[in-house]
Interface confidence: medium
């Protein structure tokens, strides 16, 4: 949270998560103010010289924009008068992480706010029954990932068991040499029973679960940000 | 509807500054993001670079050290410079309208001249 | 720099053939793909922009998809207007760069 009181506004950023090479958001609020001439948006970050992005008298203002971020930063343009100052960045890179700094002026005051960008890669998983093994087995896959991430298996009629032994995982590099494919191989999978892959790193979770009956295969992913 | 129109020397000697000027008319060169491509003879396509109406620039780094990009909003014009040119810079120069979403034209370039041949030759 | 590579680089083919052109970036670029054709002697002719978005005043017939790493150009009757160079350009950092090009001709 941003410093309030007398001449100065409350401004709020939330710690978020980039998907390299996806477009990705940066959040930040403030409080509304009707005069959009009046309003000052400054992105800095940590360890940069000139600015991310600077958005002022109802359009940006890019002469002080540092190199690396040209041509990849935008506000909401027509959502700044009701407090909203996040900053979109495309094809999130790697080094795009680090603490930011949301600075904010209005006619009613100033104020600021850091926020940690975090930066990776993180994917939905899929798991598919593997019919060409010699016994049934579940493969699961997820094309991107950064930094490698622990894979775990689990099941709902056996919770609590270990998996560590009848599964394989592997990561692939992929063609731009930085994430990675995870794959992953469940053995001796029994029908009638839910099984889920759980692929974690420090920024994302994502969960794949299978349910295999005699007469369909039922599945459902979802992935959730970490410290978000 | 909006036109552009380069203009400049055909010929060029080597070691020396090639610079040409895109004229705008039909429509304003303010919001908008102005480029340069060039095309050598028989070849693909590379950008040089692009330029915003308030002047901000990007160059393409392989020609960054000899590229100038600069807009005279007032006279709707804007201009490229490329200096100390070889026979390697022969080629058609474009000029090019450019809108986009993040400070660049990332929509693609809508409107374009219709080129001008540069010859760089003693 | 992300290179884009263009398959094929000549594509011989006929009027109503649905033709397709394949794209390929060195390293994910999302959406920020356009594509452009251009005829002998011209300048190139906006088709498509953001990988899928048709150009006002493009036929559409021409239609654009794909995202991450892969994207394709599809005609889906071919036209004798058609009959031109078609170039992918990734719009996602700069520089931006554009394929080598794909030349359709009469088949």
């Known amino acids: 949270f941003g410093i309030s009181g007398k001449h100065f506004i409350t401004v709020t950023t939330f710690t978020s998560a980039g998907n390299i090479g996806e477009d990705g958001t940066l959040s930040c609020t403030f409080e509304p103010d009707i005069k959009l001439n009046g309003i000052v948006i400054q992105w800095l970050k940590e360890g940069i010289k000139g600015l991310v992005h600077e958005f002022k008298e109802g359009k940006d203002d890019l002469s002080q924009q540092h190199e690396m971020f040209r041509g990849r930063t935008a506000v909401f343009a027509d959502q700044v008068v009701v407090g909203n100052a996040s900053l979109r960045l495309k094809n999130v890179q790697l080094t795009d992480a680090g603490t930011y700094t949301c600075y904010i002026r209005t006619s009613k005051g100033k104020g600021n706010a850091n926020l940690e960008y975090k930066t990776g890669a993180f994917s939905m998983p899929e798991i598919n029954v593997d019919y060409n093994a010699s016994s049934e087995s579940l493969r699961c896959e997820a094309p991107r990932w950064f930094p490698q991430p622990t894979v775990a298996w689990a099941s709902q009629v056996d919770q609590g068991a270990n998996f560590s032994e009848v599964s394989n995982t592997s990561f692939e590099l992929n063609s731009e040499n930085v994430t990675m494919k995870v794959v992953s191989v469940l053995y001796n999978v029994t029908i009638n029973n839910t099984y889920s892959c759980m692929i974690e790193n420090d920024i994302a979770k994502a969960t794949g679960d299978i349910k295999v009956t005699d007469s369909e295969v039922k599945r459902r992913s979802q992935l959730q940000l970490l410290n978000s | 509807q909006v036109q552009l129109q380069e203009s400049g020397p055909g010929l060029v000697k080597p070691s020396e500054t090639l610079s040409l000027t895109c004229t705008v008319s039909?429509?304003?060169?303010?919001?908008?993001?102005w480029g340069w491509i060039r095309q050598p003879p028989g070849k693909g396509l590379e950008w040089i670079g692009y330029?915003?109406?308030?002047?901000?620039?990007s160059y393409n780094p392989s020609l960054k050290s000899r590229v100038t990009i600069s807009v005279d909003t007032s006279k709707n014009q804007f201009s490229l410079k490329l200096s100390s040119v070889t026979a390697a810079d022969t080629a058609v120069y474009y000029c090019?309208?450019?809108?986009?979403?993040?400070?660049?034209?990332?929509?693609?370039?809508?409107?374009w001249g219709q080129g001008t041949t540069v010859t760089v030759s003693s | 720099d992300i290179q884009m590579t263009q398959s094929p680089s000549t594509l011989s083919a006929s009027v109503g053939d649905r033709v397709t052109i394949t794209c390929r970036a060195s390293?994910?670029?999302?959406?920020?793909l356009a594509w452009y054709q251009q005829k002998p002697g011209k300048a190139p002719k906006l088709l498509i922009y953001?990988?899928?978005s048709l150009e006002s005043g493009v036929p559409s017939r021409f239609s654009g998809s794909g995202s991450g790493t892969e994207f394709t150009l599809t005609i889906s009757s071919l036209q004798p207007d058609d009959f031109a160079t078609y170039y992918c350009?990734?719009?996602?950092?700069?520089?931006?760069?554009f394929g080598g090009g794909t030349k359709v001709e009469i088949k």
């Open positions: 330029i915003y109406s308030s002047g901000s620039t």
């Open positions: 953001k990988a899928s």
């Open positions: 350009q990734q719009d996602n950092s700069f520089p931006f760069t």
């Open positions: 090019a309208r450019g809108s986009g979403l993040y400070a660049a034209p990332d929509y693609g370039l809508d409107v």
């Open positions: 039909g429509g304003s060169i303010i919001s908008y993001y």
């Open positions: 390293q994910s670029i999302s959406s920020w």
